[in-house]
């Protein structure tokens, strides 16, 4: 029961996390104009990984994509790559984990196979979360560096007569979404890895013994008749055929997924 709950919760947490990573990657507010030195600006600038936007005094927002690939900063390209890798790994992890869920029966899939799949998806979620956290952190570091650089030469102008306030950028909402989402994906991955340990078949003390019959050379292994014997890896007396019967673990109702806001 605890294993199913841990695995199910890990899946849901990872699902929310990956949805958050996708949302963060698509968001335009990775960096937003710092209004501390210009709180009365009628033109508000903000930037994402894919385009930059300007909200004007009419309330109209104009966004323009970065139509160049080679002209973009290497750091921005790196952040894009990290986020995309995070999404791809997370998506594959989700796909794998769906089939690994204990509450879902697929043919005659062994618990050992489900355990391996759970571990694989868990590792994928962990790497996905780390990619997202790394991507967001690299971008945040880039912002901090640029912020203090622009603060150093904040005001430029002709003889100090006419002041031009240089636009400074600070953390946008997408960074916080990315950090939280990356963290959730990471936590979900860890939970999947923990669930994997509970899913892994318990080791038996019985060793396989070979019986040599005259004229035949057939090896009999205890636990071969899994539907009726108590031997081998089938220590929980589960029916291997899927006839609609469910064990105690599987009868439990699965908590519904709530919308993440």
């Amino acid at each position: 029961m605890a294993v199913t709950a841990c695995q199910g919760l890990g899946f849901v947490v990872s699902l929310i996390g990956i949805a958050g990573i996708i949302a963060a990657t698509c968001m335009d507010q990775w960096s937003t104009q710092d209004l501390y030195n210009n709180p009365v600006t009628a033109v508000f600038n903000y930037q994402g990984l894919w385009r930059s936007c300007v909200r004007e005094s009419s309330g109209f927002t104009e966004c323009r994509g970065y139509f160049t690939l080679l002209g973009l900063p290497a750091m921005l390209q790196a952040v894009r790559a990290l986020m995309i890798v995070g999404i791809v790994l997370g998506a594959i992890g989700l796909l794998v984990s769906i089939f690994a869920l204990k509450c879902i029966r697929i043919g005659s899939m062994e618990d050992s196979a489900k355990a391996n799949m759970t571990l694989t998806s868990g590792i994928m979620f962990i790497v996905s979360g780390l990619c997202a956290i790394a991507g967001v952190s690299v971008f945040a570091n880039m912002l901090v560096t640029n912020f203090w650089m622009s603060t150093a030469n904040m005001y430029t102008g002709m003889g100090g007569m006419v002041q031009t306030v240089q636009t400074r950028y600070t953390f946008g909402a997408a960074l916080f979404v990315g950090w939280v989402a990356g963290g959730l994906t990471l936590i979900g991955g860890v939970m999947m890895c923990i669930a994997c340990r509970g899913l892994a078949p318990e080791e038996t003390n019985y060793k396989a013994v070979s019986y040599h019959a005259s004229g035949h050379s057939v090896a009999y292994k205890p636990g071969g008749f899994k539907a009726s014997t108590g031997f081998g890896s089938n220590t929980k007396n589960k029916k291997i055929y899927d006839g609609g019967a469910r064990t105690e673990d599987e009868v439990q109702s699965y908590p519904s997924k709530h919308d993440y806001v």
């Epitope: 104009q33 210009n38 009365v40 600006t41 009628a42 033109v43 600038n45 930037q47 930059s52 300007v54 004007e56 005094s57 009419s58 309330g59 109209f60 104009e62 323009r64 102008g157 006419v162 002041q163 031009t164 306030v165 240089q166 636009t167």
Partner: antibody
Framework: QVQLVQSGAEVKKPGASVKVSCKAS????????MHWVRQAPGQGLEWMGL????????RLNQKFKDRVTMTVDTSTSTVYMELSSLRSEDTAVYYC????????WGQGTLVTVSS | DIVMTQSPDSLAVSLGERATINCKSS????????????LTWYQQKPGQPPKLLIY???TRESGVPDRFSGSGSGTDFTLTISSLQAEDVAVYYC?????????FGQGTKLEIK
């Protein structure tokens, strides 16, 4: 096309309040902020403030912040501007303006403050 | 507040001649986010509301005759009417669209000589 229709002329006594309405049509009402600009007789244009019809958030010129109240009724696509504690120098034509670059302007509402 | 100063206050030009109106702002109106100058030009005829002519300092609004052109960047801007027509007689205003409160120049009255 953008159309902004304002309420009729008003004559008020000093100290009173006036509420001017501006009904919008021909564009997405909540997409653009509504600005209010006034023009005293023979004078230039003076920006009073704006309201975001989507959430009723306002941004006012400090000069008017204690006397101006802007409200919105999205059901009728109408914005209201109320100016209180009227003085003789508030005699002016009041315009509402919206859309990008204040492309659309109302016909103006003449408010006369006289004792 | 950004102060907008127009010159001259009034201008008399012969029909078919070039008219030039200047506008100076106390602060730069250049937005580094998109490299646009947030200066707008309006034309106002007697008894009418202002009419948008030019935005982003040099972009002509659709329907505005191409004899109207805007130029300048930062703090210094110019509105030019290449060949004055009778219907161009009006008061012209420049407006800071970059910082609150949005401010207008005092206006330039254009007349026919």
């Amino acid at each position: 096309q953008v159309q902004l229709v304002q309420s009729g002329a008003e004559v008020k006594k000093p100290g009173a309040s006036v509420k001017v309405s501006c009904k919008a049509s021909g564009y997405s009402f909540t997409t653009y902020w509504m600005h209010w600009v006034r023009q005293a007789p023979g004078q230039g244009l003076e920006w009073m403030g704006l309201i975001d019809p989507s959430d009723s958030e306002t941004r006012l010129n400090q000069k008017f912040k204690d006397r101006v109240t802007m409200t919105v009724d999205t059901s009728t696509s109408t914005v209201y501007m109320e100016l209180s504690s009227l003085r003789s120098e508030d005699t002016a034509v009041y315009y509402c303006a919206s859309n990008r670059w204040l492309l659309g302007w109302g016909q103006g509402t003449l408010v006369t403050v006289s004792s | 507040d950004i102060v907008m100063t127009q010159s001259p206050d009034s201008l008399a030009v012969s029909l078919g001649e070039r008219a030039t109106i200047n506008c100076k702002s106390s602060q730069s109106l250049l937005n580094s986010g998109n490299q646009k100058n947030y200066l707008t030009w309006y034309q106002q005829k007697p008894g009418q509301p202002p009419k948008l002519l030019i935005y982003w300092a040099s972009t002509r609004e659709s329907g505005v005759p191409d004899r109207f052109s805007g130029s300048g960047s930062g703090t210094d801007f110019t509105l030019t009417i290449s060949s004055l027509q009778a219907e161009d007689v009006a008061v012209y205003y420049c407006q800071n669209d970059y910082s609150y409160p949005l401010t207008f120049g005092q206006g330039t009255k254009l007349e026919i000589k």
